[in-house]
């Protein structure tokens, strides 16, 4: 069980020792469902900068390099935890907050809704 | 600037009011780079359960439903913040920790390095 209010050390421990977090940095361009990354900044939040993925196309890129609208580019979303200053501008009091971020895009077969 | 140790209220505020976090729940199956979700549980971490995506195939699914090895399924990874009990089993003392999670998979044109 977790108590309501806890002490948190902000000196981050990075467990990504065996992996290269930059590894997927070029996928946004090489994917069949490419995306752009948009900077979302909020000084009241920790981390203050979060990058949001936005799919470039409604369809997916085919072998000829053209957009194929028989397929759909869709964002892969994940709920992440951030710290929000509470009350606002507070130097050392925060509240956990859950936000939904788009991490990248994937190409899916569309769900066809038949229009009568 | 952020101090080293702060007070955090664990009563989570969910800002995902206008979205349905389950919306992308079937993409793992409909994607041309489908993935399986594996449960990663750690009682010393908050959140204690994290879902890891593992791409099903080395290649991507083509229009015929077959795996095309001229394309690659790759994991989209994201660094996220979690709380780690410190010292271990501590009821109300935590440290911020950065971990790398695979959120889903996307289909990319390969960088040919070592495949003959």
């Amino acid at each position: 069980n977790f108590p309501r209010t806890v002490m948190v050390n902000l000196n981050i421990h990075n467990r990504n020792t065996n992996t290269n977090p930059k590894r997927s940095s070029d996928y946004y361009d090489r994917s069949t469902s490419p995306w752009n990354l948009h900077r979302n900044e909020d000084p009241e939040r920790y981390p203050s900068v979060i990058w949001e993925a936005k799919c470039r196309h409604l369809g997916c890129i085919n072998a000829d390099g053209n957009v194929d609208y028989h397929m759909n580019s869709v964002p892969i979303q994940q709920e992440i935890l951030v710290l929000r200053r509470e009350p606002p501008h507070s130097p050392n009091s925060f509240r956990l907050e859950k936000i939904l971020v788009s991490v990248g895009c994937t190409c899916v077969t569309p769900i066809v809704h038949h229009v009568a | 600037n952020f101090p080293r140790t702060v007070m955090v209220n664990l009563n989570i505020h969910n800002r995902n009011t206008n979205t349905n976090p389950k919306r992308s729940s079937d993409y793992y199956d409909r994607s041309t780079s489908p993935w399986n979700l594996h449960r990663n549980e750690d009682p010393e971490r908050y959140p204690s359960v994290i879902w890891e995506a593992k791409c099903r195939h080395l290649g991507c699914i083509n229009a015929d439903g077959n795996v095309d090895y001229h394309m690659n399924s790759v994991p989209i990874q994201q660094e996220i913040l979690v709380l780690r009990r410190e010292p271990p089993h501590s009821p109300n003392s935590f440290r911020l920790e950065k971990i790398l999670v695979s959120v889903g998979c996307t289909c990319v044109t390969p960088i040919v390095h070592h495949v003959a």
Epitope: - | H38, N40, K54, R56, H57, P75, V108
Partner: nanobody, 123 residues
Framework: QVQLVESGGGLVQAGGSLRLSCAAS????????MGWFRQAPGKEREFVAA????????KYADSVKGRFTMSRDNAKKQVYLEMNSLKPEDTAVYYC????????????????WGQGTQVTVSS
């Protein structure tokens, strides 16, 4: 830290067969494929074969297609390379490794390699 132990190499005559094994421990949650690689004297390490842990789907280098077969045992976290119709040009040290990005994993991203197992094919 990923630990890799390769075994099963040896000296064999051209046309013969060998079965290599690789035991992997400490794989990360993001691991979804394993690969076999080889390095002949004076040459760069090259890709031989890969297998998906989940689907069992495989990919082979053109030079070994139809002769080599890769398989895996998820429970034991082991992968195997069945090598038939061996040729002198297959002589090399054979290594296995985790492929966290599948076929897209680059050689320069490997922080760790096992000792490998020597395969020598005599004519």
């Amino acid at each position: 830290q990923v630990q890799l132990v390769e075994s099963g190499g040896g000296l064999v005559q051209a046309g013969g067969s060998l079965r290599l094994s690789c035991a992997a421990s400490g794989l990360t949650a993001s691991s979804y494929a394993m690969g076999w690689f080889r390095q002949a004297p004076g040459k760069e390490r090259e890709f031989v074969a890969a297998i998906s842990w989940i689907s069992g789907g495989t990919k082979y280098a053109d030079s070994v297609k139809g002769r080599f077969t890769m398989s895996r045992d998820n429970a034991k976290k082991q992968v195997y390379l069945e090598m038939n119709s061996l040729k002198p040009e297959d002589t090399a040290v054979y290594y296995c490794n985790d492929m966290p990005y599948g076929l897209d994993t680059r050689m320069d991203e490997y922080a760790y390699w096992g000792q490998g197992t020597q395969v020598t094919v005599s004519s």
